[in-house]
Interface confidence: medium
């Protein structure tokens, strides 16, 4: 079976002018997934991202996250790239509100 992830992108201010953007993937199966931040359409290097473990979420599916720190005002340059079981998608940083996107099967 394949269950596509729900992808959710959120922002939180960490200091003046700087924000942490977090991309969460949840409720997916199987557990293999690629989740990475892109800037200007290119994957960020590993040393500028933090990843969470891929963990079971209690429903027979999995969840994980990736975060990076960016400067306020450059949100439009960043997208979260997800690849899972042959499906892939890009998810922008929301402007002012949380964005929840269901990947297509």
């Amino acid at each position: 079976r394949t269950v596509p992830p729900m992808v959710n992108v959120t922002c939180s201010e960490v200091s003046e002018g700087n924000i942490t953007v977090t991309c969460r993937a949840s409720s997916f199966y199987p557990r293999n997934i690629t989740l990475t931040w892109r800037q200007d359409g290119v994957s960020l290097s590993h040393n500028t991202q933090q990843w969470g473990d891929v963990l079971p979420d209690g429903n027979g599916t999995y969840q994980t996250w990736v975060a990076t720190r960016i400067r306020q005002g450059e949100e439009q340059r960043f997208t979260c790239y997800m690849e899972h079981s042959g499906n892939h998608g890009t998810h922008p940083v929301p402007s002012g509100k949380v964005l929840v996107l269901q990947s297509q099967r």
Epitope: V14, S15, G17, N18, R38, Q39, D40, G41, V42, S43, L44, S45, H46, N47, T48, T68, R69, I70, R71, E74, R77
Partner: antibody, heavy 121, light 112 residues
């Protein structure tokens, strides 16, 4: 080894058009962003345009915005710069460069030999 | 746009002696990811530019270790510990933090 070969330069009248090409080899072209940089005769370097690996992110210098169009054909390992409404101040050697700054690497680590564009009546 | 300045614009050096080039930016190039997006290039006579230093202080592949880069958010220095004849050319700093990317005017290093 990595090779970038520009072509398409030449003499053109003000208001005319040219299309520059950059043929890439020796690396997986579709994985990398690319940029065009130019250098007027006897002058310094000026960044012109950027395109992401998939062509979904494109940026231009203000001096060429609305006149120049960057594009790529990943199947042909080629980068292009369509230049319209050319002006005398566009006269320069145009270089194509790789842009690998997000791969734990760095930007502009490979440059072509350049192609000269001369805009004159 | 971020404005880049360099000094000196001309630098005559005796082979074997050290050399230092200064670069300044009108805005801090320190990103919140702690990388500083300042690059150094050398353009030898009749050649395309080549990268020397990336992200302020990292030596690019194949570049001799007599070159080094340092600095803070807005003030940067390229040092050559012992200049050799092959080091002649024009040295450019460039900010790669935000669009449009901008270069300094260049510093011409020549052998005395």
């Amino acid at each position: 080894q990595v090779q970038l070969v520009e072509s398409g330069g030449g003499l053109v009248k003000p208001g005319g058009s040219l299309r520059l090409s950059c043929a890439a080899s020796g690396f997986t072209f579709s994985n990398y962003a690319m940029s065009w940089i130019r250098q007027a005769p006897g002058k310094g370097l000026e960044w012109v345009s950027y395109i992401s690996p998939g062509g979904d992110y494109i940026y231009y210098a203000d001096s060429v915005k609305g006149r120049f169009t960057i594009s790529r054909d990943n199947a042909k390992n080629s980068l292009y710069l369509q230049m319209n409404s050319l002006r005398a101040e566009d006269t320069a050697v145009y270089y194509c460069t790789t842009d690998r700054r997000h791969y734990g690497s760095y930007a502009m680590d490979y440059w072509g030999q350049g192609t000269l564009v001369t805009v004159s009546s | 746009d971020i404005v880049m300045t360099q000094s000196p614009l001309s630098l005559p050096v005796t082979p074997g002696e050290p050399a230092s080039i200064s670069c300044r930016s009108s805005k801090s190039l320190l990103h919140s990811n702690l990388n500083t997006y300042l690059y150094w290039f050398l353009q030898k006579p009749g050649q395309s530019p080549q990268i020397l230093i990336y992200r302020m202080s990292n030596l690019a592949s194949g570049v001799p270790d007599r070159f080094s880069g340092s600095g803070s958010g807005t003030a940067f220095t390229l040092k050559i510990s012992r200049v050799e004849a092959e080091d002649v050319g024009v040295y450019y700093c460039m900010q790669h933090l935000e669009y449009p990317f901008t270069f300094g005017p260049g510093t011409k290093l020549e052998i005395k």
